[in-house]
Interface confidence: medium
Amino acid sequence: FPMFKRGRCLCIGPGVKAVKVADIEKASIMYPSNNCDKIEVIITLKENKGQRCLNPKSKQARLIIKKVERKNF
């Protein structure tokens, strides 16, 4: 296991590389803040199947971040 350094983050560990698009209810992006010094991408799954932390360095996460930023700015 690699060692993980943590601040006040919700996601522990690297997160998943990808989630099936059809399973995604919504995606939330937590930007670095006083709570956590790294970006976190949290996927809420459909049918109340919980949440997943998406690895922010993954291709899917980068696409989601880009999409959200385009929508917001």
Epitope: F1, C11, I12, G15, R52
Partner: antibody, heavy 122, light 108 residues
């Protein structure tokens, strides 16, 4: 108020299995990283396992790796510890503890159960 | 694995006195250190998190200090209910989360 209640402990023979449960209430369980910590009779605290809020990654102490499995059911607000191939040295009081998410995060294990005794003996 | 060493193993003091408990880490844990109090037959209770922050409901007589490898828990004026075992714990580099071996604070 916040409550963590462990169950499933007892006396078990070496090599056998046991499953502990921890029922949570009074906080947002689905946002919280949860741990199992144990304490052998007359000894100090030993961290056993961690499961983040999403239940995807799981982390274990070397002493239990490959034998114990931590899991959670966020719909039931319940944490589990499946203990297989039990050994005499696993005899301890087992505590479940919360390490919060964004809500109420306190940078440590801020809520603990009362503990449940597991005795491994022939 | 980061090893936490607590000293002294036992501290004998009287109510009203000041208690100073030490925790030393084998490598830097930044400020990611917590302190817990445990009384016989009870679960541990979080006192201090992130080296110096008092947890909810903890009296002001408890304070924490330090960063890197050296940390101190101070109880400014001991109350009868403060006699217990105290543990430090790091959450900087893990797995595993590690605890110190404990300091027993007993009545002199």
């Amino acid at each position: 108020q916040v409550q963590l209640v462990e169950s499933g402990g007892g006396v078990v023979q070496p090599g056998r299995s046991l499953r502990l449960s921890c029922a949570a209430s009074g906080f947002t369980f689905s946002n919280s990283a949860m741990h199992w910590v144990r304490q052998a009779p007359g000894k100090g605290l030993e961290w056993v396992a961690l499961i983040p809020f999403d239940g995807y990654n799981k982390y274990y102490a070397d002493s239990v790796k490959g034998r114990f499995t931590i899991s959670r059911d966020n719909s039931k607000n319940t944490l589990y510890l499946q203990m297989n191939s039990l050994r005499a040295e696993d005899t301890a009081v087992y505590y479940c503890a919360r390490e919060g998410g964004y809500t109420g995060y306190d940078g440590g294990f801020d809520y603990w159960g009362q503990g449940i005794l597991v005795t491994v003996s022939s | 694995e980061i090893v936490l060493t607590q000293s002294p193993a036992t501290l004998s003091l009287s109510p009203g006195e000041r208690a100073t408990l030490s925790c030393r880490a084998s490598q830097s844990v930044s400020s990611y250190l917590a302190w817990y109090q445990q009384k016989p037959g009870q679960a541990p209770r979080l006192l201090i998190y992130d080296a110096s922050n008092r947890a909810t409901g903890i009296p002001a007589r408890f304070s924490g200090s330090g960063s890197g490898t050296d940390f101190t828990l101070t109880i400014s004026s001991l109350e009868p209910e403060d006699f217990a075992v105290y543990y430090c714990q790091q959450r900087s580099n893990w797995p595993p989360y590690t605890f110190g071996q404990g300091t027993k604070l007993e009545i002199k």
